[in-house]
Interface confidence: medium
């Protein structure tokens, strides 16, 4: 397993005042269909709003390494493989849940954390604001 | 407070040996910056590749209701407002953390899962398979 | 069909406490939160707090701290709602709305109140 | 808290006209912003959540729009079961707060 440097104050788990705690098992289950999501489509290169994935590492986080989605372009991809502006790339956003260790360096105290991710992007018809 | 049929199988929080278990502070500790995200982005209709927001439920899982994205066409909206089959919507995945009560019922315990949700679509050339 | 089933009128004297259930039923109950909204009469709508079974946490407007609380049983469905030290400015219609506390478009914990009770009426009066 | 404010207070309409309610937050919410209708002696009923999304149900008339700090709801073409007080909700931040309320009544 993993040593984790321990921090004298750690709060005790068996304290029924630590603030809305509860137990967690971490041997997380997954739920996916027995397809593999990891095969994870090269829709990043195909899309007509293509995007790079960008590495983000936090070693204090659970999962410590989350990708993020940022749009190459500010318009879209036609037919002709060139950027037509009349369109927007925009990035898809989710929050994901995430654990935290908290205090810094306790093996086994976390706070769930919400982060908010670029999935992917997609290509929308811009808004016109027109001036009077 | 709630009052939970308990479960008598409920672990101990004490256990030493419940597998890979840790206290989590629930109280979620929100990362997204300091300009609120929530905005109710119109994507989902002006995208060339637009999606429908269908519900999921399970009563023993945190978040009971996830709202997932379907793509409301095989092809993808061309500049006439027509769908373009020479194009294929296609739905972006990403996997979310959830809570299960596990042993149900225990309303102290729970177990992380990883879920597959469909968030948005983009449109992407086809892989087109020429039959010799 | 969802349905939220609140408890009979009540008519109080100033001082005494006052508990309303409100009875969920043709969906799930712990998934959700149950908030309690009241109106006075003629006025508009006040949230007054909350509970989310799934994990028992309750929440409430500083307005009504230290003299609401807020309870649900798992077994029975039911949500109830307490208010002690009752005035006459409690004469209201008190409701009990389900909070679908979804992951909506891509947030997690959004809330609205997707289905409400048929409100149950309490005068307070010497 | 959050304060949500409304416009106009009432509004005397004759049916098929379109009826415009504004609400106007005190501080960003986001899209965390709801549309409720309720009829005299009924409960509220959800029309609009999340500033646009109509719910199952809810007539196509009725729309919203906005995020931030202003929003609005619409009523395209009224008629004579939408008279009632309509009601704006944030749930960005606790505590929870409505809209004074909007009075609609038919001419």
């Known amino acids: 397993g993993i040593t984790i440097p321990r921090n004298p104050g750690c709060p005790n788990s068996e304290d029924k005042n630590f603030p809305r705690t509860v137990m967690v098992n971490l041997n997380i289950h997954n739920r996916n269909t027995n397809t593999n999501p990891k095969r994870s489509s090269d829709y990043y290169n195909r899309s007509t709003s293509p995007w790079n994935l960008h590495r983000n590492e936090d070693p204090e986080r659970y999962p410590s390494v989350i990708w993020e989605a940022k749009c190459r372009h500010l318009g879209c991809i036609n037919a002709d493989g060139n950027v037509d502006y009349h369109m927007n790339s925009v990035p898809i956003q989710q929050e994901i849940l995430v654990l935290r260790r908290e205090p810094p360096h306790c093996p086994n105290s976390f706070r769930l954390e919400k982060i908010l991710v670029s999935v992917g992007c997609t290509c929308v018809t811009p808004i016109v604001h027109h001036v009077a | 407070g709630i009052t939970i049929p308990r479960n008598p199988g409920c672990p101990n929080s004490e256990d030493k040996n419940f597998p890979r278990t840790v206290m989590v502070n629930l109280n979620i500790h929100n990362r997204n910056t300091n300009t609120n995200p929530k905005r109710s982005s119109d994507y989902y209709n002006r995208s060339t590749s637009p999606w429908n927001l269908h519900r999921n439920e399970d009563p023993e899982r945190y978040p009971s209701v996830i709202w997932e994205a379907k793509c409301r066409h095989l092809g993808c909206i061309n500049a006439d407002g027509n769908v373009d089959y020479h194009m294929n919507s296609v739905p972006i995945q990403q996997e979310i953390l959830v809570l299960r009560r596990e042993p149900p019922h225990c309303p102290n315990s729970f177990r992380l899962e990883k879920i597959l949700v469909s968030v948005g679509c983009t449109c992407v050339t086809p892989i087109v398979h020429h039959v010799a | 069909e969802v349905q939220l089933v609140q408890s009979g009128a009540e008519v109080k004297k100033p001082g005494e406490s006052l508990k309303i259930s409100c009875k969920a039923s043709g969906g799930s109950f712990k998934g959700y939160g149950i908030s309690w909204v009241r109106q006075a009469p003629g006025q508009g709508l006040e949230w007054m707090g909350g509970i989310t079974p799934f994990f028992g946490w309750t929440d409430y407007a500083q307005k009504f701290q230290g003299r609401v609380t807020i309870t649900a049983d798992e077994s029975t469905t039911t949500a109830y709602m307490e208010l002690s030290g009752l005035t006459s400015d409690d004469t209201a219609v008190y409701y009990c709305a389900r909070d679908p506390n979804e992951f909506w478009n891509g947030y997690y914990a959004t809330h609205d109140f997707d289905y409400w009770g048929q409100g149950t009426t309490v005068t307070v009066s010497s | 808290e959050i304060v949500l404010t409304q416009s106009p207070d009432f509004q005397s309409v004759t049916p098929k006209e379109k009826v415009t309610i504004t609400c106007r937050a005190s501080q960003d919410i986001g899209s965390d912003l709801h549309w409720y209708q309720q009829k005299p002696d009924q409960s509220p009923k959800l029309l609009i959540k999340?500033?646009?999304y109509s719910t199952s149900g809810v007539p196509s008339r009725f729309s919203g729009s906005g995020s931030g700090t202003d929003f609005t709801l619409t009523i395209n073409g009224l008629e004579a079961e939408d008279a009632g007080t309509y009601y704006c909700?944030?749930?960005?931040?606790?505590?929870?707060?409505f809209g004074q309320g909007t009075k609609v009544d038919i001419k």
């Open positions: 909700h944030q749930t960005d931040g606790l505590p929870y707060t």
């Open positions: 999340y500033a646009s």
